[in-house]
Interface confidence: low
């Protein structure tokens, strides 16, 4: 594949990454799949600067990110180490709350209306953010 050197149309560039901000809602798994089909992944927040950038663009709206604990420990979808990485949970979160009556706990992380993170039921139809890194190999065939 070719190296991507600029962001696709309707994506926003920031610090050598490209971001796409949805304006509709999907369950976490559907949002995850959407990003993958775009040769991207749900956003992985690795710094305070990236947190502020994303927060600025999404506004006060619940929005999925690429962090989940559906298989036990919390994991970022791109393999970034969770334990040593940046975190911005709300106080007392994540709490894997079972009291919502929807079955199971809360396994997917989202930005809340104030930007801090919360874990929630993965089936909720929240907005989402896709991210892809510039300079990584694209799956598209090179232009001849």
């Amino acid at each position: 594949g070719s190296e991507r050197t600029c962001c696709p149309v309707n994506w926003v560039e920031h610090e050598r990454s490209c971001y796409w901000f949805s304006r509709s809602g999907k369950a976490w798994a559907d949002a995850d799949n959407y990003c993958r089909l775009e040769d991207a992944h749900l956003v992985v927040v690795t710094s305070w600067e990236e947190q502020k950038f994303v927060q600025h663009h999404i506004g006060p709206v619940n929005t999925w990110m690429g962090l989940h604990d559906q298989n036990g420990p919390w994991k970022w979808v791109d393999g970034t180490d969770y334990e040593t990485g940046f975190k911005n949970w709300r106080p007392e979160q994540p709490d894997d709350w079972y009291g919502h009556g929807l079955g199971g706990g809360e396994d997917c992380a989202h930005f809340t209306d104030d930007g801090r993170w919360n874990d929630d039921v993965c089936q909720r139809p929240y907005r989402w953010v896709c991210e892809t890194e510039l300079d990584k190999a694209s799956q598209e065939p090179p232009l001849l």
Partner: antibody
């Protein structure tokens, strides 16, 4: 360089309402929580509460019934009101920015508020 | 509410010595949302350490933080004259945010 400048009445009578304002200079106002913290003379620090630029608030339960925080994003200012003050509310009041890992990374200069009849 | 207990209340040391300040929480401080501040008379507190072990901007590397769960430590490897002050720990792993009562570091 982000700086916080605060002001408000320094001398109050019991039962009056304390009112302080904090202005943010040289940096972003949105994307942060803004907090109020107080320190009685010779004592430790007590968190009063915080607010986000969208208007979300989070107060210390011990003061919640008397506290109101508000924000004016156009002026990059946030304010504290504490009603029905008593001598126990005498303290230096600080505004502060809630930064990375929920730590207070930038502080105002402090305002000494004395409640006395 | 998480209660933070700092010890010792007062620590008397000489410049050049090593200072070890302790902060113990009544419950786990989730994700190490614990910070350390220095305060000098008549001044606002200054952030030294956040996230239990990350030095704030402009803080000399003689200051270091460690710990997790309920036990946290601030270490000043080699005391300078300007380090004598009151030090506070603070947690926000659980609401409400709370501070320790402070440790006064004085010149011996």
């Amino acid at each position: 360089q982000v700086q916080l400048q605060q002001w408000g009445a320094g001398l109050l009578k019991p039962s009056e309402t304390l009112s302080l304002t904090c202005a943010v200079f040289g940096g972003s106002f949105s994307g942060h929580y803004w907090s109020w913290i107080r320190q009685p003379p010779g004592k430790g620090l007590e968190w009063i509460g915080e607010m986000y630029h969208f208007g979300n608030t989070n107060y210390n339960p011990s003061l919640k019934s008397r506290v109101t925080m508000s924000v004016d994003t156009s002026k990059k200012q946030f304010s504290l009101k504490l009603s029905s003050v008593t001598a126990a509310d005498t303290a230096v009041y600080y505004c502060a920015r809630v930064g990375q890992w929920l730590a207070f990374d930038i502080w105002g200069q402090g305002t000494m508020v004395t409640v006395s009849s | 509410e998480i209660v933070l207990t700092q010890s010792p209340g007062t620590l008397s040391l000489s410049p050049g010595e090593r200072a070890t300040l302790s902060c113990r929480a009544s419950q786990n401080v989730s994700y190490s949302y614990l910070a350390w501040y220095q305060q000098k008379p008549g001044q606002a507190p200054r952030l030294l350490i956040y996230g239990a072990s990350r030095r704030a901007t402009g803080i000399p590397d003689r200051f270091s933080g460690s710990g997790s769960g309920t036990d946290f430590t601030l270490t000043i490897s080699r005391l300078e004259p300007e380090d004598f002050a009151v030090y506070y720990c603070q947690q926000y792993g659980s609401s409400p945010c709370s501070f320790g009562q402070g440790t006064k570091l004085e010149i011996k």
